[in-house]
Interface confidence: low
């Protein structure tokens, strides 16, 4: 007869490992007992359990409560055992020794491999600002056994670099994603993808990119200068910019204080019925935590009386 087992048994941390050992004997042969031991290189054998055909299962104190026989029905030639709740320290070589009648003793070895699935963590880098050079956007670390694979899934253009630290029973892999920040990256997802044989599917952690920037400021409202005449109601200037974080707006007048009745409402400067007092240079200040910008415009309030008077003069002169 001969023993049937596996070269390698692979189990995920915390699961039960079935250690197979089946005697395929000739007709009439019987298994008297099966001894299981851990036999790592350089260390003496450590007994796990003894499975006796008459007296049943005896588990050594070191494995009390962790070694069981598979559930019935059981074949008398099957010396397999279950190792409950596998931990990393269980990884190693195991041997089953089978005593048979009348053929004598047989032994076989297998390797137990305990997969430790990673628990990845994603750490954002320093604050991203437009105008920086190549900058760390995020790093992703996953530790497991065997070493996990760490990659990135994103539409953003960047470069990656990886390093790994080997520990006694596992390996930690850190991948870093670098990019040159631009405002178009705002709100874009950067996803760390961790693959590992102990995972049913890849683990994904997503970080949303935030890039600080502030666009140039411009002022709207003076497109038609002829509308800015004495008496006009509802005249307004609007300051245009955009940024991350969203900017705040402030209005000042370069050649003196804001005239009375002028309302500041965020990015908008609202005027009462226009008078010549409203002529002047107005400055919109736009700022956020990243930067600040200014845009200035000159308001020249027209007096229709003066204009019509000039026209009459011109007509009479001709």
């Amino acid at each position: 007869g001969e023993l049937e087992t596996s070269d390698v048994v692979t189990v995920v941390l915390g699961q039960d490992a079935k250690l197979p050992c089946f005697y395929r004997g000739d007709s009439g042969e019987q298994v008297g007992q099966v001894a299981w031991a851990r036999v790592d290189a350089g260390e003496g054998a450590q007994e796990l359990a003894l499975l006796h055909s008459k007296y049943g299962l005896h588990v050594s104190p070191a494995y009390e409560g962790r070694v069981e026989q598979p559930p019935p029905p059981r074949n008398p030639l099957d010396g397999s055992v279950l190792l409950r709740n596998a931990v990393q320290a269980d990884e190693g070589e195991y041997e089953c020794r089978v005593s048979t009648f009348p053929a004598g003793s047989f032994q076989a070895r297998l390797r137990l491999r305990v997969l430790v699935p990673p628990l990845p963590s994603l750490n954002p880098g320093p604050a991203l600002e437009e105008g920086q050079g190549l900058t760390l956007a995020a790093s992703c670390t996953a530790e497991g056994s065997p070493a996990p694979s760490v990659t990135w899934d994103t539409e953003v253009k960047g470069t990656t670099s990886s390093r790994s630290f080997k520990h006694s029973r596992s390996a930690a892999v850190t991948s870093e994603f670098h990019l040159v920040p631009s405002r178009s990256m705002n709100g874009q997802p950067l996803t760390c993808v961790v693959s590992h044989p102990g995972l049913l599917q890849d683990q994904r952690i997503t970080h949303i990119l935030h890039v600080s920037f502030l666009a140039e400021a411009s002022v709207r409202g003076l497109e038609d200068q002829n509308l800015w005449h004495i008496g006009r109601e509802g005249a307004m200037l609007k300051c245009l910019s955009e940024g991350q974080p969203p900017p705040s707006y402030n209005w000042t007048r370069l050649d003196g204080p804001l005239p009375s009745g002028v309302r500041v409402d965020g990015d908008t400067l609202g005027f009462p019925p226009l008078t010549t007092e409203h002529s002047g240079i107005y400055v919109c200040h736009v700022s956020n935590e990243f930067s600040s910008r200014d845009s200035q415009v000159t308001v020249d309030v027209l007096d229709p009386q003066e204009d019509s008077g000039k026209q009459v003069d011109l007509v009479s002169a001709s």
Partner: antibody
């Protein structure tokens, strides 16, 4: 407030093991890494190793075989051991806190360790 | 290991001066750089991290700049409490420190 308080002997004999303890307060060891840095008299700073918030350790490759960093989170303590010391290991030893990166925002007061018979 | 070369090794300056200290890395460290100040007999104190970010409580007269392999710490309007030794330190892989710059009173 955040504090790192160091303790340990100031004199160690050659070939023996240097042992220092860093007791922290004001933050949790499960949220921050604790590093060890040394400074020989009149010289610059040298990074020795770290125990990260998750419990894993990294060491300076040039000293790795002699260093062990461990922690007891229930006591808020980090332990540093350096075996087989020589006179060249005479230095002020600091523990220091970091977040996810290797820069140090809070430092212990430092312990001068002299290696001499 | 990445080597950090700091210059100058020492300098003399007066209160009110502007002081510039540079640090060169032997390879690109992608802004993974910190600056520390250390006074005689005291522990180092973090001034700047990630090349340009001022640590909490650090006066605005300190500023960090640079990218790639070249980095600078600038102190505007030097104060009497700014005298001491300054170190740069990269944190791109195994950390190493620069040799230090001693800022003394002229």
């Amino acid at each position: 407030q955040v504090q790192l308080q160091q303790s340990g002997p100031g004199l160690v004999k050659p070939s023996e093991t240097l042992s220092l303890t860093c007791t922290v307060s004001g933050f949790s060891l499960t949220n921050y890494g604790v590093h060890w840095v040394r400074q020989p008299p009149g010289k610059g700073l040298e990074w020795l190793g770290v125990i990260w918030s998750g419990g894993s350790t990294d060491y300076n490759p040039s000293l790795k075989s002699r260093l062990t960093i461990s922690r007891d989170t229930s006591k808020n303590q980090v332990s540093f051991k350096m075996s087989s010391v020589t006179a060249a290991d005479t230095a002020v030893y600091y523990c220091a806190r970091s977040g996810k990166w290797y820069y140090f925002d809070y430092w212990g007061q430092g312990t001068l360790v002299t290696v001499s018979s | 290991d990445i080597q950090m070369t700091q210059s100058p090794a020492s300098l003399s300056a007066s209160v009110g001066d502007t002081v510039t200290i540079t640090c060169r890395a032997s390879q690109n460290i992608y802004s993974n750089l910190a600056w520390y100040q250390q006074k005689q007999g005291k522990s180092p104190q973090l001034l700047v991290y990630a090349a340009t970010n001022l640590a909490d409580g650090v006066p605005s007269r300190f500023s960090g700049s640079g990218s790639g392999t070249q980095y600078t710490l600038k102190i505007n309007s030097l104060q009497s409490e700014d005298f001491g030794t300054y170190y740069c330190q990269h944190f791109w892989g195994t950390p190493t420190f620069g040799g230090g710059t001693k800022v003394e009173i002229k």
